[in-house]
Interface confidence: medium
Amino acid sequence: GITNINCSGHIWVEPATIFKMGMNISIYCQAAIKNCQPRKLHFYKNGIKERFQITRINKTTARLWYKNFLEPHASMYCTAECPKHFQETLICGKDISSGYPPDIPDEVTCVIYEYSGNMTCTWNAGKLTYIDTKYVVHVKSLETEEEQQYLTSSYINISTDSLQGGKKYLVWVQAANALGMEESKQLQIHLDDIVIPSAAVISRAETINATVPKTIIYWDSQTTIEKVSCEMRYKATTNQTWNVKEFDTNFTYVQQSEFYLEPNIKYVFQVRCQETGKRYWQPWSSLFFHKTPETVPQVTSKAFQHDTWNSGLTVASISTGHLTSDNRGDIG
């Protein structure tokens, strides 16, 4: 950065190099150049010479004043016009930053995604601070009273192997930057209550042409959790409102769910599951599209980036695009 340059003087910022966005600030430049009584002192911001609000304080020092400074980062340097020098002489430079103190972290959430081997903790950090903000996640065992701390810039993955203090913990988050520090409320967790089952996947759909045409959605999960509750939501792609069907599921075989849908309409399906009676849901699965036929039977098939099985019925189509859901982060 600009702070690494060789200086022939001094540059400093009041109230500080990192300050609250919107403040009035002063940048001072003091020359200390051999055999030079500066005729003029110049300030540059991000390489552009400043023309206004410069005050000469004495023979070697000048001040640049900014009202309501709103830029998150700027590189400042100052130069001197020395007699008998054709070019301006560099005095010194400094990187300055403006931002906000952190908000109180809220909505602290910790989950264990099945098979991940980690407890993932997230929180709402509040408004953007614009400056380097660190978070310390405190995890305290309610059984042993032992506390562990983890430093991070965003969320944190904590290996479940490191959670040796039983099943019950308190978790809270401290946010800190150069402008302030805040602490969240404490979240009490039980490790058995925060497991989210392995993702459910809709793999294919078929419409059977009976007296009343019936669409069967095939879906599965690799979860080993025995009691799982799932929701499948579906709607015509032209509609805003979702219909939701609930299922109590045992994933020892491929699930088949039946729907009676309107003919010749494109529908979209998503599924999500949770361990029965627990708090957190999976994110909704990828969007799965299926167009119901006018009369003939139809099969649609999809797996993440892979093709998957489809039956030998007369009309078949494969959809392999990976379309993410409209709210993948919804685990509450």
Partner: nanobody, 124 residues
Framework: QVQLQESGGGSVQAGGSLRLSCAAS????????MGWFRQAPGKEREGVAT????????VYADSVKGRFTISQDGAKKTVYLQMNSLKPEDTAMYYC?????????????????WGQGTQVTVSS
């Protein structure tokens, strides 16, 4: 009725490659897992690789990791086993199998449906 038909076996020199295919009858789409297994003369049948058709997740035996790749083509209702850097100890009858229930296991007893097998011979 679920039917599985393997092809692609043959003889190859050590270090060579083969690609096995397993074509499934329409009924196989209800299977939860598909897998490749092998049986050398005088030895028990062992798991090589399995795939979860819904999501494409795969599991490999330690002895073939990094050399063999299991994949699928849903449109053709086919599972493949790409075998690279073959060794003489890979010589065996290779079977395709489908499991209607259960987990992604390399244990043969969890699989309900079996093909007739295709012979792979690797000479040094």
């Amino acid at each position: 009725q679920v039917q599985l038909q393997e092809s692609g076996g043959g003889s190859v020199q050590a270090g060579g490659s083969l690609r096995l295919s397993c074509a499934a009858s329409p009924g196989t789409y209800t299977s939860r897992y598909m897998g490749w297994f092998r049986q050398a003369p005088g030895k028990e049948r062992e798991g090589v690789a399995t795939i979860w058709p819904a999501g494409g997740n795969t599991v490999y035996a330690d002895s073939v990791k990094g050399r063999f790749t299991i994949s699928q083509d849903g449109a053709k209702k086919t599972v493949y086993l790409q075998m690279n850097s073959l060794k003489p100890e890979d010589t065996a009858m290779y079977y395709c199998a489908a499991a209607k229930y259960g987990g992604t296991s390399l244990a043969p007893y969890t699989y309900n449906y079996w093909g007739q097998g295709t012979q792979v011979t690797v000479s040094s």
